[in-house]
Interface confidence: medium
């Protein structure tokens, strides 16, 4: 039992740490494996995880995490049975990948413009909340060289497009994605994606017909 | 069905040799440590060494190297230990026991008695 | 090698008392310790690993505590059955070493 890439863990900065590593051979993660955590703190507990499979020999832990400050460390040692294969250490605040942004929806708004708006997913306590910047990726479900790409770097979770900018009578998918610049983090993972149909004749003779979202 | 069977016990002369067997069943044998304990009578447990059957790997306490070789026929999922030289020092019960996580076991030991 | 140490050779409790049992390391193992149970002319029985995690099938009145040096057993309402001798194990250094065991006897 040999790892072949080691555990690479991001935290949301909040409640999880997600751990995911590969093995040199097809694995089943549960069975043969468990990640062992503990925040470098006298005092602190020892937790063990179990890891699922994410592909034939590629591991993911999920570890519930106390609200994360910058400090925090936690010693991780991954163990097939007594066989120690990876020791390391994590630092919650300098691997952040924030949450997914949720509950992306579509209106259509004044000045032929549609809304499209999202919630920050921490709540307004947490350190991120006012940290997050968000990408928004517009695409035309029927012509792969029609997509746009909006960057948020305005607190608040909206946009607003210009149906003019968009081709009449298209079908559009937007989802969006946040990151945290003070903490240098990844993008956290693309919301799953909302519909609509772009006009930008009147709206008001195709909002009860024509206007739609949902997600896939 | 006992995970771990082990051979029954034996009988030897100082100098001689014996080789115990341990059966497994039930379980992925290739890919699971063995380890081999022993234990003296009324006395503790001593890691003598484990072996990976996957790929014969072995890793021993240094206080049983030379005396114990550990070895795997993964065709049969059997594990064996050989331990040489034998003296009255070596009279005791040997374990062998896999201990991964919620799968853990041990066989029911042998008896290995070094006699005149 | 390292050592380790369980200091109380016997301990001696009562059915429905709470008994702890110690092992302490001669150097950092972090969690890579486990507990056995031996009864009398038994196998021993695996009932902790990692420090902490009760193995399957081990009532739950078992728990393990401890990282680092100091690690402890500790048993909630003692059984008659619970008679048997205690030995931890650390996994984190070869060769793998055990405490010499703590003999528990019921009143």
């Known amino acids: 039992v040999k790892v072949l890439h080691e555990p690479s863990c991001f935290s949301d900065y909040i409640s999880t740490s997600v751990c995911q590593w590969k093995m040199d051979h097809p694995t089943n993660c549960s069975a043969e494996l468990r990640l062992s955590y503990q925040l470098d703190f006298m005092g602190s507990e020892n937790h063990t995880c179990v890891p699922e499979n994410r592909e034939d020999s590629v591991c993911v832990c999920s570890m519930p995490i106390d609200d994360a400050v910058e400090a925090d460390v936690y010693q991780l040692d991954l163990w097939a049975g007594q066989q120690l294969l990876w020791s390391g250490s994590f630092q919650p605040s300098k691997h952040v990948k924030p949450r997914t942004p949720g509950n992306l929806t579509v209106h259509p708004n004044i000045s032929h413009t549609w809304l499209l708006m999202w919630t920050n997913p921490y709540p307004t306590e947490n350190h991120l909340h006012s940290e997050l910047t968000y990408m928004v990726n517009v695409s035309n479900d029927n012509d792969p060289e029609d997509f746009k790409v909006y960057n948020v770097t305005y607190m608040g979770p909206t946009l607003r497009l210009a149906a003019s900018t968009l081709k009449s009578g298209a079908s559009y998918s937007a989802r969006v994605r946040a990151w945290a610049q003070t903490y240098n983090s990844t993008w956290s993972d693309w919301s799953p994606s909302t519909t609509w149909l772009n006009y930008y004749e009147p709206w008001e003779q195709h909002l009860p017909h024509h206007h739609h979202h949902h997600h896939h | 069905q006992v995970p771990l069977q082990q051979s029954g016990p034996e009988l030897v002369k100082p100098g001689a040799s014996v080789k115990i067997s341990c059966k497994a069943s039930?379980?992925?044998?290739?890919?699971?440590?063995m380890n081999w304990v022993k234990q003296r009578p009324g006395k503790g447990l001593e890691w003598i060494g484990r072996i990976y059957p996957g790929d014969g790997d072995t890793k021993y306490n240094g206080k049983f190297k030379g005396k114990a070789t550990l070895t795997a026929d993964k065709s049969s999922s059997t594990a064996y230990m050989q331990l040489s030289s034998l003296t009255s020092e070596d009279s005791a019960v040997y374990f062998c026991?896999?201990?991964?996580?919620?799968?853990?076991?041990w066989g029911q030991g042998t008896l290995v008695t070094v006699s005149a | 090698d390292i050592v380790m140490t369980q200091s109380q050779k016997f301990m001696s409790t009562s059915v429905g008392d709470r008994v702890s049992i110690t092992c302490k390391a001669s150097?950092?193992?972090?969690?890579?310790v486990a507990w056995y149970q031996q009864k009398p002319g038994q196998s021993p029985k695996s009932l902790i690993y990692?420090?902490?995690n009760r193995h399957t099938g081990v009532p739950d009145r078992f728990t393990g505590s401890g990282s680092g040096t100091d690690f402890t057993l500790t048993i909630s309402n003692v059984q008659s059955e619970d008679l048997a001798d205690y030995f931890c194990l650390q996994h984190w250094n070869y060769p793998f070493t055990f405490g010499s065991g703590t003999k528990l006897e019921i009143k």
């Open positions: 990692l420090a902490s």
């Open positions: 150097q950092n193992v972090r969690s890579a």
């Open positions: 026991a896999r201990d991964d996580y919620d799968e853990a076991s």
């Open positions: 039930g379980y992925a044998f290739s890919s699971s440590w």
